[in-house]
């Protein structure tokens, strides 16, 4: 008799794929544009990335460091009107993209939460949650919560408001902290909170260190849903050298939880390559004309247009990973088991019941390595086969779809492999 199928877990929309942050509308759209109407015109691009949610803004009125002139219910006219916002919401809905609104109050000022009048600001946030929920947004983000006194209790209250409206609504909190204990204390009192942090931001050194960080986090958070990013707002290139971007894309898309990216991560957007551009929000490179300041500074392979035409580009990898992440049960909600694969490597299996299983092997080092996969580390339910098919490599040159012998697996410097193999009873 065939074994009984495992019951599928309840899945919220943010469990099904990546979130895409557009913190600066002007930088994202470029060419002196930067409003909600213009963003609506970019929704097809977001659809092509297969992202499930757009984290937008802040876009509310905020006079720098002035509580009285900060109105979370009013859209800054520079970004558009409520009608423009409503139109964006309707269009996003038609494309199955959820809209998450960033309500970080003093986003133009020194302290995101103002240094005084905490209760006044917290009440403003409560009002804004209620107003925008009724206006149709799918969730909220608040950043820099390390600057918010009594953050845990406020987050619990805001979470109650958000979930009280509908269980299908999301609250994201962001912190600059990379300290696991601080992160856990924020998560403790907030069951369904999605937290973005700088926890993984110093993981670029070795595979062992990354493995240790990831497994520690997953063990500490138990069976709660996580999010994966390198920071609450910044680009991957702020933390990673170019050669590790593909590896990290593969990792973020295949860890158990919601991957969260910033606009430009999909093309390796790097402020350092664009003189005069702010580190936190460089202009998005749609094509070679997006950065006219210095002629010739932008080559085609740095842009969305150029990378869209190249199947081997970072953008193409992002699209493929995003597609896999959103349709494979083992990646959507599968169990996770990390195991030893040798120094410099981080490897893990994702599996769900009798569905196709995935093996991820990541070489963080700058030398080629043979993987010594220690299958003995794995539980019986997640045993490794002798061979697995190569779904994709982060490096060119491998024949996709070909079976690889796992005992003889060799990885190039900074290479990541995504392999698939069937369930075997």
């Amino acid at each position: 008799r065939a074994p009984r199928c495992r019951e599928l877990p309840a899945q919220k929309w943010w469990h099904t794929g990546a979130l895409y942050r557009i913190g600066d509308l002007q930088a994202f759209q470029g060419h002196g544009a930067g409003n909600l109407a213009g963003l609506k015109g970019r929704l097809d691009y977001l659809s092509s990335l297969k992202v499930k949610g757009l984290v937008l803004g802040p876009i509310h009125k905020n006079q720098k460091d002035d509580v009285a002139q900060t109105d979370l219910l009013q859209i800054d006219p520079n970004f558009g009107s409520k009608e423009d916002f409503d139109s964006l919401l309707q269009s996003a809905k038609k494309k199955s993209i959820r809209v998450i609104l960033d309500l970080t109050p003093n986003y133009r000022g020194e302290n995101s939460w103002f240094s005084t009048q905490v209760d006044t600001v917290a009440t403003k946030v409560k009002d804004a949650l209620e107003f925008w929920l009724q206006a149709g947004v799918d969730g909220f983000q608040v950043r820099d919560i390390e600057n918010l006194k009594d953050a845990s209790s406020f987050l619990a209250e805001w979470q109650n408001i958000t979930k009280g409206f509908s269980e299908d609504r999301l609250l994201i909190a962001g912190t600059n902290s990379s300290d696991l204990q601080q992160i856990l204390s924020l998560l403790e009192s907030n069951k369904d909170l999605l937290l973005t942090s700088s926890y993984l931001s110093d993981s670029g050194s070795t595979g062992e260190h990354t493995k240790s960080l990831v497994t520690q986090y997953l063990n500490a958070t138990g069976n709660r849903w996580c999010s994966w990013s390198l920071s609450q707002a910044r680009l991957l290139t702020s933390f990673l050298p170019a050669q590790l971007l593909r590896l990290y894309q593969l990792m973020l898309f295949t860890l158990p939880g919601t991957p969260v990216f910033s606009y430009g991560d999909e093309i390796g957007l790097d402020a350092a390559a664009l003189p005069g551009q702010p580190m936190e929000a460089p202009v998005m490179l749609w094509d070679e004309s997006s950065f006219p300041d210095i002629p010739g500074a932008v080559s085609a392979n740095m842009t969305v247009k150029g990378q869209s035409e190249d199947p081997g580009s970072l953008l193409s990898l992002f699209r493929r990973l995003s597609d896999q992440r959103s349709k494979e049960r083992s990646l959507l909600h599968g169990d996770f088991h990390a195991f030893s694969a040798g120094p410099g490597l981080f490897s893990y299996i994702r599996h769900w019941d009798q569905n196709e299983r995935f093996l991820v092997v990541l070489n963080f080092g700058d030398v080629g390595l043979s993987a010594g996969l220690q299958a003995s580390d794995l539980p019986a339910s997640a045993s490794l086969p002798a061979k697995a098919d190569l779904l994709l490599s982060t490096q060119p040159g491998r024949e996709e779809g070909s079976p690889l012998e796992l005992e003889r697996l060799k990885l190039e410097p900074h290479e990541g492999l995504l392999l698939r193999f069937p369930y075997a009873a």
Partner: antibody, heavy 119, light 114 residues
Framework: QVQLQESGPGLVKPSETLSLTCTVS????????VHWIRQPPGKGLEWLGL???????NYNSALMSRVTISKDTSKNQVSLKLSSVTAADTAVYYC?????????????WGQGTLVTVSS | DIVMTQSPDSLAVSLGERATINCKSS????????????LTWYQQKPGQPPKLLIY???TRESGVPDRFTGSGSGTEFTLTISSLQAEDVAVYYC??????????FGQGTKVEIK
């Protein structure tokens, strides 16, 4: 118990500014929003604006350039100002509490105050 | 702005009989986010302020007699008084409280005893 009481001059000259105060008791203005509504004699209700617990304000766009709502939490008072009034602004003016989360319904109303615009 | 239209303008019903008031909105008042319909009913007796009867189209405010029932969804709504009492003589208003302001009222329906 929850109470709201409107007060202000009953007669205002055309082109002047109408100023009304709503004094509340039995609840805190830092926990609840307050709406202003008006009703011309023998006619229906018109929503003017809402001041939220945190101080944000939604106005009726038809009157937006003329209406100002503010509050003094320490005095438990909300005020309404309507500038450049004409005879068409003659009405009973009500303040009412926004009483429910995820709803703009008004669960408690003041008795209303009649304002006549006439020279 | 959402336009609210009530019918009839006035209604005469015998004591103990059913009174039915209709309200139509120019766009749907259903919020797909929480599946609630953002329509409110008020009762205004002569010389008094309005009184909240029903919100979310069908949720009765506490203390409101159960002879008052709200129904409908999308753009068409009904307030039913199952057995009219003398104290129910009043003008009844529907109000949209959906999404963005202004939160507009219907023109009112006057209920009298036949």
């Amino acid at each position: 118990q929850v109470q709201l009481q409107e007060s202000g001059p009953g007669l205002v000259k055309p082109s002047e500014t109408l100023s009304l105060t709503c004094t509340v008791s039995g609840f805190s203005l830092t926990s609840y929003g307050v709406h202003w509504i008006r009703q011309p004699p023998g006619k229906g209700l018109e929503w003017l604006g809402l001041i939220w617990a945190g101080g944000s304000i939604n106005y009726n766009s038809a009157l937006m350039s003329r209406v100002t709502i503010s509050k003094d939490t320490s005095k438990n008072q909300v005020s309404l100002k309507l500038s450049s009034v004409t005879a068409a602004d003659t009405a009973v003016y009500y303040c009412a509490r926004k009483g429910h989360m995820y709803s703009y319904a008004m669960d408690y109303w003041g008795q209303g105050t009649l304002v006549t615009v006439s020279s | 702005d959402i336009v609210m239209t009530q019918s009839p303008d006035s209604l005469a019903v015998s004591l103990g009989e059913r009174a039915t008031i209709n309200c139509k909105s120019s766009q749907s008042l259903l919020n797909s986010g929480n599946q609630k319909t953002y329509l409110t009913w008020y009762q205004q007796k002569p010389g008094q302020p309005p009184k909240l009867l029903i919100y979310w189209a069908s949720t009765r405010e506490s203390g409101v007699p159960d002879r008052f029932t709200g129904s409908g969804s999308g753009t068409e709504f009904t307030l039913t008084i199952s057995s009219l009492q003398a104290e129910d003589v009043a003008v009844y208003y529907c109000q949209n409280d959906y999404s963005y302001p202004p939160w507009t009222f219907g023109q009112g329906t006057k209920v009298e005893i036949k």
